[in-house]
């Protein structure tokens, strides 16, 4: 790391080290030989999250309901607002600027992991012995019916999309 001219939490201006403004405050005027750095708190709708020499605070993120967003955590003078998605929606990207509906798992696929506000539904193919006959964002693959436990026999084999069909055992004459 290259050498620095100032202490931590200071910056160099006019060949002098001045204190940075603390998080939640913006720079009004640089220090001089006789005066300290002048800082002012950010307004209610603004923030700065680091020791800084910014002359303007950043605007809090707006969670636009038209994009499916709602406030998860209200911003402070030191932190930005955190948005999340409304029920049934998840973020399109890491920055969560808009939301999209959770996808459904098609017949033949079941839900491996239910969607959250930040992640989409994860589907998995139904393995042998399991099926899903619906398009759903919640349903897992269900096991085929066990005909034997009902004293029945398989009349039609199951698939990944259909359950087995059970029927009575043929009686021997």
């Amino acid at each position: 790391e290259p050498p620095t001219a100032c202490r931590e939490k200071q910056y160099l201006i006019n060949s002098q080290c001045c204190s940075l403004c603390q998080p939640g405050q913006k720079l009004v005027s640089d220090c001089t030989e006789f005066t300290e750095t002048e800082c002012l708190p950010c307004s209610e709708s603004e923030f700065l999250d680091t020791w800084n020499r910014e002359t303007r605070c950043h605007q809090h993120k707006y969670c636009d309901p038209n994009l499916g967003l709602r406030v998860q955590q209200k911003g402070t003078s030191e932190t930005d607002t955190i948005c999340t998605c409304e029920e049934g929606l998840h973020c399109m990207s890491e920055s969560c600027e808009s939301c999209v509906p959770h996808r459904s798992c098609l017949p033949g696929f079941g839900v491996k992991q239910i969607a959250t506000g930040v992640s989409d539904t994860i589907c998995e193919p139904c393995p042998v012995g399991f099926f899903s006959n619906v398009s759903s964002a919640f349903e897992k693959c269900r096991p085929w019916t066990s005909c034997e436990t009902k004293d029945l026999v398989v009349q039609q084999a199951g698939t990944n999309k259909t359950d087995v069909v059970c029927g009575p055992q043929d009686r021997q004459r």
Epitope: A5, Q10, S15, C17, C18, E36, T37
Partner: antibody, heavy 126, light 107 residues
Framework: QVQLVQSGAEVKKPGASVKVSCKAS????????MHWVRQAPGQGLEWMGW????????NYAQKFQGRVTMTRDTSISTAYMELNRLRSDDTAVYYC???????????????????WGQGTLVTVSS | DIQMTQSPSSVSASVGDRVTITCRAS??????LAWYQQKPGKAPNLLIY???TLQSGVPSRFSGSGSGTDFTLTISSLQPEDFATYYC?????????FGGGTKVEIK
């Protein structure tokens, strides 16, 4: 009372490394930068760099970049200075020195050394 | 880097004399200057900081003045224990730099 106690004298061969320790007592170790200053025989004082014991942040003089490492162990209130690839002109007394308190300084770096270690003589000779 | 030039490099004086040492910075350093006293085999001892503030426990015969590039350390009435080497140090920006030292010797 504030005390900085350094490790004992060292004799090293050129190309070797040396690690000098500085144990602080009598004050809050993490509340003050620790600097290292050296003095070659019959010569003046030369600043080497600082460590912030609270954050572990360091700042080294350009001359020593890549050769010096300053570390600390807050559990035993001790700062360390390691100098690598020693040369004969590194023969000097090495001092640790305590700066003004963190947050004391608003303009300038205002690094003034009110307490010093007793010094550690490092001799580099083949 | 800021160069600190001290003069004279040595001065011979008698007990009771007034001694003045000057220190010049290669660029303005406001009032960010310290003075140290060092005796043979010992670590330096802080006398004055921010150009003119006397460190606690330092006798009032020591005084400092100046700002910008030119600074002065004055010993108003030299005492036997004052025979030592004196260093100035700029504390405006890193790297910190010291003057070459002024040795105050007995005449």
């Amino acid at each position: 009372q504030v005390q900085l106690v350094q490790s004992g004298a060292e004799v090293k061969k050129p190309g070797a490394s040396v690690k000098v320790s500085c144990k602080a007592s009598g004050y809050t170790f993490t509340g003050y930068y620790m600097h290292w200053v050296r003095q070659a025989p019959g010569q003046g004082l030369e600043w080497m760099g600082w460590i912030n014991p609270d954050s572990g942040g360091t700042n080294y003089a350009q001359k020593f970049q890549g050769r010096v490492t300053m570390t600390r162990d807050t559990s035993i209130s001790t700062a360390y200075m390691e100098l690598n690839r020693l040369r004969s002109d590194d023969t000097a007394v090495y001092y640790c020195a305590r700066d003004q308190p963190l947050g004391y300084c608003t303009n300038g770096v205002c690094s003034y050394f009110d307490y010093w270690g007793q010094g550690t003589l490092v001799t580099v000779s083949s | 880097d800021i160069q600190m030039t001290q003069s004279p490099s040595s001065v011979s004086a008698s007990v009771g004399d007034r001694v003045t040492i000057t220190c010049r910075a290669s660029q303005g350093i406001y009032s960010w200057l310290a003075w140290y006293q060092q005796k043979p085999g010992k670590a330096p001892n802080l006398l004055i900081y921010t150009a003119s503030t006397l460190q606690s426990g330092v006798p009032s015969r020591f005084s400092g003045s100046g700002s910008g590039t030119d600074f002065t350390l004055t010993i108003s009435s030299l005492q036997p224990e004052d025979f030592a080497t004196y260093y100035c140090q700029q504390a405006n920006i890193f790297p910190l730099t010291f003057g070459g030292g002024t040795k105050v010797e007995i005449k």
